[in-house]
């Protein structure tokens, strides 16, 4: 006899782990055999959906590999045309081992700021999150807290907070560990020991001492009267995040020396400064030596161009260096009377500084040539037309004295201020705009304050009247 369908085994709640199999059973008695359909959250499950297997005339529904999105209410409906359709429903609860969906990452933070290390998790039941620092569980306190999200928040970061961290997510089904990350705490540069001021005699040696700390360990640079230190030797040592810098100077002029400690935090820098003055008690006569010696310029022609009390190199290959070099300048100077007002001050500065080169005193006094960049600018920019004429006359031997050749430096043989700023002298005449000045400033004996790339420095040949320099 025909019999309406009856569900003899109602659906029950099924617990399943992700990637495991889950089966619902819907046992039906009826005649004729019913048609059984399945729904999830009231949406029909299609017979050909490959994620499911429907067997035993539709009475068994198997989810072949459970995903967390399979959570929901599953219903089977049986109908054979006799009486009404019958339905039974049950829930699928997807259980999940803990999973860390947003793990922590390495962090660099400046001391005193707030750090947050993320640790977002998934799992059912909801995992609890704890943190490990080094090898020990991390204890929360007034500064350190694990947030509801699982992230670790550290207020007012201290140096001792630096270290290796990992988060741990745990529920009844298992435990997940994040990879180990590093929290680096950076500290602004500060000076622990400032250089001391000195009052010394001309030609004496002085050592300035500067100590600084910070994380990363700062670098120390020395500034002399606003420019990068041009002479003197620097010795540095680093121990326990403290850098110690000693600047040894041969004193030939008074100056303000500044120690600058700098360290980098991402794209930004922090700096600390301390300064000391060097004053000269009494001036003693410079020592002569067999190639040349340093002396103050006492001539007339270059008075307006060279700095007051400038130390210049006097070449002892001349019987009377001061007079011979003054004569050289004088000869060249006369040629400049006819040049343009743009060219003249530039050319005068170049000639005076080429013949009376700045002098670096020391065991062996050394002439400091003009930087090739300034030489080029004077020759090819300020005095382009005049220089062509001048060089043509030189090559054709039209000058009264062979000595005049000395007043025309060969720019390509001079050291570059970009490659080795300490190897050459600049012409401050070019540092000023003509609209800012009524007259051009005197020469200063400072070197260019420029970036020094990590490159081989210029090597100078032994001094001759017209020195040559090569850049290796």
């Amino acid at each position: 006899l025909p019999k309406a369908p009856v569900i003899t085994t109602p659906l029950e709640t099924v617990d399943a782990l992700v990637e495991e199999v889950a089966t619902f059973m819907c046992a039906v008695e009826s005649y004729p055999q019913p048609e059984i359909s399945w729904t999830r959250n009231k949406i029909l499950i299609k017979l050909f959906d490959t994620r499911y297997s429907i067997r035993e005339n539709g009475q068994l529904l198997t989810i072949l590999s459970v995903e967390d999105s399979d959570d929901g209410i599953y219903c089977c409906t049986a109908n054979n045309g006799v009486g009404g359709a019958v339905e039974s429903c049950g829930a699928l609860q997807v259980k999940m081992k803990p999973k860390i969906t947003r793990p922590p990452i390495n962090v660099k933070i400046i001391e005193g700021l707030k750090a947050v290390l993320p640790c977002t998790t998934m799992g059912n039941p909801k995992p609890s999150v704890s943190w490990i620092k080094g090898d020990s569980p991390l204890r929360e306190n007034s500064r350190i807290a694990v947030l509801e999200s699982g992230s670790l928040r550290i207020h007012n970061v201290q140096k001792e907070d630096a270290g290796q961290y990992r988060c741990v997510a745990k529920n009844s089904l298992g435990t997940a560990y994040s990879k180990v990350v590093k929290l680096e705490v950076e500290v602004f540069a500060r000076i622990l020991r400032a250089p001391e001021s000195h009052n010394v005699t001309f030609g004496s040696f002085v050592t300035l001492h500067c100590t600084a700390t910070g994380i990363p360990v700062p670098t120390i640079t020395w500034i002399e009267n606003g420019n990068a230190v041009s002479s003197g030797s620097i010795q540095e040592s680093v121990k326990d995040r403290v850098i110690d810098s000693r600047l040894q100077l041969f004193i030939t002029k008074p100056g303000l020396y500044t120690c600058i400690a700098t360290n980098k935090h991402g794209e930004k820098f922090s700096t600390a400064k301390a300064a000391a003055t060097i004053s000269i008690a009494e001036w003693s006569k410079p020592q002569k030596d067999n190639k040349g010696y340093c002396a103050q310029y006492r001539g007339e022609v270059c008075n307006a161009v060279l700095a007051k009390d400038a130390l210049v190199f006097l070449n002892t290959s001349y019987a009377d260096p001061e007079e011979a070099q003054e004569l050289l300048v004088h000869t060249a100077w006369n040629e400049l009377k006819v040049v343009s007002p743009v060219c003249r001050p530039a050319a005068e500065a170049l000639l005076c500084n080429h013949i009376f080169q700045e002098c670096s005193p020391g065991v062996v006094p050394t002439p400091i040539p003009i930087c090739r960049e300034y030489c080029l600018a004077v020759k090819e920019l300020f005095c382009a037309k005049e220089w062509l004429v001048m060089e043509e006359k030189t090559h054709r031997g039209l000058y009264r004295s062979e000595m005049h050749l000395l007043s025309v430096p060969e720019c390509s043989k001079l050291p570059s201020m970009h490659w080795d700023p300490t190897a050459c002298a600049r012409l401050p005449h070019l540092d000023y705009n003509k609209e800012n000045l009524k007259t051009f400033p005197p020469m200063t004996s400072s070197k260019p304050s420029v970036d020094i790339p990590n490159l081989p420095s210029s090597s100078s040949s032994s001094f001759s009247v017209s020195p040559t320099y090569s850049m290796t």
Epitope: A377, L381, C411, S412, E435, V450
Partner: antibody, heavy 117, light 107 residues
Framework: QVQLVQSGAEVKKPGASVKVSCKAS????????MHWVRQAPGQGLEWMGI????????SYAQKFQGRVSMTSDTSTSTVSMELSSLRSEDTAIYYC??????????WGQGTLVTVSS | DIQMTQSPSAMSASVGDRVTITCRAS??????LAWFQQKPGKVPKRLIY???NLQSGVPSRFSGSGSGTEFTLTISSLQPEDFATYYC?????????FGQGTKLEIK
């Protein structure tokens, strides 16, 4: 007169290298530094680096460090610039230029390098 | 590295106008700044050297000023051939750096 003549246009695949040459004439080759500057289509000028042809000292912009190499051959008065690990954003006109800031500046005619898969 | 910021990045003006382009350096570059003009499909041409000096052969309507970190290029009376892109270049230290350019268009 001073002339800088560059090699012809190049088409390269990503990851490849390109070498652009610049032949100088009309002056003493070793007396002047040579710069390399590039310009992507519709973009501005970008300084890549400099070479001293006498001795071969170089200084490169940080952006190109490790990918660029500049060399000079005094026997042929030629400087070359090689850029490796090319990517599409390296598509540009590459110029050699003599003494950009300090002396008389002279420019090559430019070499178009196209990077495309 | 020294950053060079040019303003405006583009502007339109009429023949006869006075035009000023500014270039700002991220640190002191003394006077070591050059101005270049570039027309489409052409190589750049230097107009001004060492901040305020007119390159030989460049019309006197072009002038440069400034030192330290602030520089300007002025065209006193714009001519039809002046519509181009202008760049500043710092050559105080390596790496040299250009401004991003100012495109000057006809209004």
């Amino acid at each position: 007169q001073v002339q800088l003549v560059q090699s012809g246009a190049e088409v390269k695949k990503p990851g490849a290298s390109v070498k652009v040459s610049c032949k100088a004439s009309g002056y003493t080759f070793t007396s002047y530094y040579m710069h390399w500057v590039r310009q992507a289509p519709g973009q501005g000028l970008e300084w890549m680096g400099i070479i001293n042809p006498s001795g071969g000292s170089t200084s490169y912009a940080q952006k190109f460090q490790g990918r660029v190499s500049m060399t000079s051959d005094t026997s042929t008065s030629t400087v070359s610039m090689e850029l490796s690990s090319l990517r599409s954003e390296d598509t540009a006109i590459y110029y050699c230029a003599r003494e950009l800031g300090w002396g008389s500046d002279y420019w090559g005619q430019g070499t178009l390098v196209t990077v495309s898969s | 590295d020294i950053q060079m910021t040019q303003s405006p990045s583009a502007m339109s003006a009429s023949v006869g106008d006075r035009v000023t382009i500014t270039c700002r350096a991220s640190q002191d570059i003394r006077n070591y700044l050059a101005w270049f003009q570039q027309k489409p499909g052409k190589v750049p041409k230097r107009l001004i050297y060492i901040a305020s000096n007119l390159q030989s052969g460049v019309p006197s309507r072009f002038s440069g000023s400034g030192s330290g970190t602030e520089f300007t290029l002025t065209i006193s009376s714009l001519q039809p051939e002046d519509f181009a892109t202008y760049y500043c270049l710092q050559h105080n230290s390596y790496p040299y750096t250009f401004g991003q350019g100012t495109k000057l268009e006809i209004k």
